[in-house]
């Protein structure tokens, strides 16, 4: 590798390092499908953006190899724990790979946040957060589900949402 | 831009690199104020530091524009939830631009800790952690908000928290 | 600092940011060792990776002096809440240093989940997030631990983890 | 301060077509979205499209798509609007404005664009 | 995305108030708190009076006030002055990444 191909290659780094991946998705009404898919998420206006990630049916698309740092965070609520809701909340990230056809496990919480409420007419509110590295390849994609979905609560886009970013 | 030109940039980014901007300010008993306004925090004692942004009465103040992906965590604990005291806290991250006198939310969480106490008397105890990756110009300013603060327990700078690093 | 003294940095950094220290490790069986020591962890199958970083007896040993963001997440869960059980629970990131003989805290969470169970047979589940930037020299090393441990609930990887990158 | 800037007046024959541009300033231009927002004589505001400047994304409103075009040049910190197909009904004031969050602020000070035999 | 409803226009007089209704659906005004207003003097571009529905930027009266109930909202205007006299707009987001601006409102000041 002489001088001038790593010349070239400082000048491509530095360019690459403008434009370092980086997304944050947030919630809207129609992140919430009940179609027993994973959230949908806006990606432009607003606090959402996208800078060397795309998007596609509510996953992440990666387009450039490497460790990303992914995150989630839902804002979980209810009155009382209605019959017919899980106890048990289950909030993941999980990856799409074309070399698999199941989606593969990244990062998952369990929560019981109905059991605070004392008394079925009580209003609850939770908030679950998941947040780690995983290496992605170009093409992987990355999305969030939520069992049970009844559950999650969003407003303004602030309160539930979905990013990452390389590392 | 010629090989000169580039050099100088490299060179430039270079020593930026080495400061990309980050930060993280820990509790401490001066944190709540009772006044309203937005948690203070600790900048250089213990684990606290700033490294490329500043602070400015619980503000950390953006010097250098672009994504940042901040955090904060708080630590809630009482005994039982006496009356007076809302039932849900709301934790936030909030932003302040000169332009828009009231600040715009950028991350929050609701949570109900109280309902998880059975008995008046019982202590709980109980986290919220938020963290996400927003954009913000040189100048603006991140402050970390609870409703209520009277929940929030400080203890030696490691419970409660808030930080921040461009990506 | 000489334009070829600038070159060597330049190429010496462009290959150093090609592994900007990372790691992610995963919770396994193994991980609750019931000796009160810290939690142990999956460095290479599956999810779990080191890069620029090592490993030993669970701790996170770094190799190159910086500011990282390390973070944890451990699943919690249990049946009802047990006598000889804590009602709270400690879940923290703690820094070993040669020059100190005790572990320093770096981020500390404290919660009540049990107390979300209204009777001594429901199941309930909880989940504990961490992450901030420190400080850390080469050689220093990082630990998680919980308290009380046997709340925390092992599956697959995911749900319990520990990791940390350069910022 | 944020300020965008717009291109002069336009006189235009039916069926030509018109590049209006939007030069900004006071901002990180890559990190917000360009609106395109048009106002024809005596009616209402009437949105056209976006822009994602920092990876050139567009959407476009219905009505318009197929006849609008909406570009970016990050190193003038410019954007442009581009309409073909024009008709006399396309006589009006051109607005960009940037999206800040979920509104409009600031915006253009406008272009005329007339459609003209 | 059809445009929200406003009335076409509103009259008052000096030093009272008059309150301008933005009414859409659940999938915008009503879904979200990002109802925006718009002043519009002849001639001139449209300037931010009112953001995330009530919210006032720097440099606006605080005569100015904003509201939402339910699928509508309201831009109040108190202490009606002359130079008041302008055309208002809404405008809300509406969910995957689209927007939609009121017909628009024309204030005459008696």
């Known amino acids: 590798d002489g001088p001038a191909g790593s010349w070239e290659q400082l000048i491509q780094e530095r360019r690459s390092h403008e434009v370092n991946p980086a997304a944050h998705l947030t919630g809207a009404n129609s992140s919430l499908t009940g179609s027993g898919g994973p959230l949908l998420w806006e990606t432009q206006l607003g606090l959402a953006f996208l800078r060397g990630l795309s998007y596609h049916d509510g996953a992440l698309v990666v387009t450039k190899a490497g460790y990303y740092y992914i995150y989630s965070k839902v804002q979980l609520g209810g009155v009382g724990c209605p019959l017919g809701l899980a106890s048990t909340i289950t909030h993941g990230l999980y990856k799409r790979t074309p070399r698999y056809p199941e989606e593969l496990e990244l990062l998952v919480s369990q929560q019981s946040p109905c059991g605070r409420a004392t008394s079925s007419s009580r209003v609850w509110w939770d908030s679950s957060f998941l947040g780690g590295v995983v290496h992605l390849e170009a093409g992987e994609k990355v999305v969030v589900r939520v069992l049970d979905e009844r559950l999650v609560r969003l407003r303004d886009g602030t309160r539930s949402y979905f990013g990452a970013f390389m590392v | 831009d010629g090989p000169a030109g580039s050099w100088e940039q490299l060179i430039q980014e270079r020593r930026s690199h080495e400061v990309n901007p980050a930060a993280h300010l820990t509790g401490a008993n001066s944190s709540l104020t009772g006044s309203g306004g937005p948690l203070l925090w600790e900048t250089q004692l213990g684990l606290a530091f700033l490294r490329g942004l500043s602070y400015h009465d619980g503000a950390l103040v953006v010097t250098k524009a672009g994504y940042y992906y901040i955090y904060s965590k708080v630590q809630l604990g009482g005994v039982g939830c006496p009356l007076g005291l809302a039932s849900t806290i709301t934790h936030g991250l909030y932003k302040r631009t000169p332009r828009y006198p009231e600040e715009l939310e950028l991350l929050v969480s609701q949570q109900s800790p109280c309902g998880r106490a059975t008995s008046s008397s019982r202590v709980w105890w109980d986290s919220s952690f938020l963290g996400g990756v927003v954009h913000l110009e040189a100048g603006e300013k991140v402050v970390v908000r609870v409703l209520d603060e009277r929940l929030v327990r400080l203890r030696d700078g490691t419970r409660s928290y808030f930080g921040a690093f461009m990506v | 600092d000489g334009p070829a003294g600038s070159w060597e940095q330049l190429i010496q950094e462009r290959r150093s940011h090609e592994v900007n220290p990372a790691a992610h490790l995963t919770g396994a069986n193994s991980s609750l060792t019931g000796s009160g020591g810290p939690l142990l962890w999956e460095t290479q199958l599956g999810l779990a990776f080191l890069r620029g970083l090592s490993y030993h007896d669970g701790a996170l040993v770094v190799t190159k002096a910086g500011y990282y963001y390390i973070y944890s997440k451990v699943q919690l869960g249990g049946v009802g809440c047990p006598l000889g059980l804590a009602s709270t629970i400690t879940h923290g990131l703690y820094k070993r240093t040669p020059r100190y003989p005790e572990e320093l805290e770096l981020l500390v969470s404290q919660q009540s989940p049990c107390g979300r169970a209204t009777s001594s047979s429901r199941v309930w589940w909880d989940s504990s997030f961490l992450g901030g930037v420190v400080h850390l020299e080469a050689g220093e090393k990082v630990v998680v631990r919980v308290l009380d441990e046997r709340l925390v609930r092992l599956r697959d990887g995911t749900r319990s983890y520990f990791g940390a990158f350069m910022v | 301060q944020v300020q965008l800037v717009q291109s002069g007046a336009e006189v235009k024959k039916p069926g030509a077509s018109v590049k209006v541009s939007c030069r900004a300033s006071?901002?990180?231009?890559?990190?917000?979205?360009m609106h395109w927002v048009r106002q024809a004589p005596g009616q209402r505001l009437e949105w056209m499209g976006w822009?994602?400047?920092?990876?050139?994304?567009?959407k476009y409103s219905q009505k318009f798509q197929g006849r609008v075009t909406i570009t970016r040049d990050t190193s003038a910190s410019t954007a442009y609007m581009e309409l073909s197909g024009l008709r006399s009904e396309d006589t009006a004031v051109y607005y960009c404005?940037?999206?800040?969050?979920?509104?409009?602020?600031?915006w253009g000070q406008g272009t005329l664009v007339t459609v003209s035999s | 995305q059809s445009a929200l409803t406003q009335p076409a226009s509103v009259s008052g007089s000096p030093g009272q108030s008059i309150t301008i209704s933005c009414t859409g659906t659940?999938?915008?005004?009503?879904?979200?708190?990002?109802v925006s207003w718009y002043q519009q003097h002849p001639g001139k571009a449209p300037k931010l009076m009112i953001y995330d529905v009530s919210k006032r930027p720097s440099g606006v009266s605080n005569r100015f006030s904003g509201s939402k109930s339910g699928n509508t909202a309201s831009l109040t205007i108190s202490g009606l002055q002359a130079e008041d006299e302008a055309d208002y707009y809404c405008f809300s987001y509406a969910g995957s990444s689209t927007v939609v601006f009121g017909g628009g409102t024309k204030l005459t000041v008696l």
């Open positions: 659940s999938s915008d005004v009503g879904g979200y708190n990002y």
């Open positions: 404005a940037r999206n800040y969050y979920n509104w409009f602020d600031p």
């Open positions: 006071g901002y990180t231009f890559t990190s917000y979205l």
């Open positions: 822009i994602n400047v920092g990876n050139g994304n567009t």
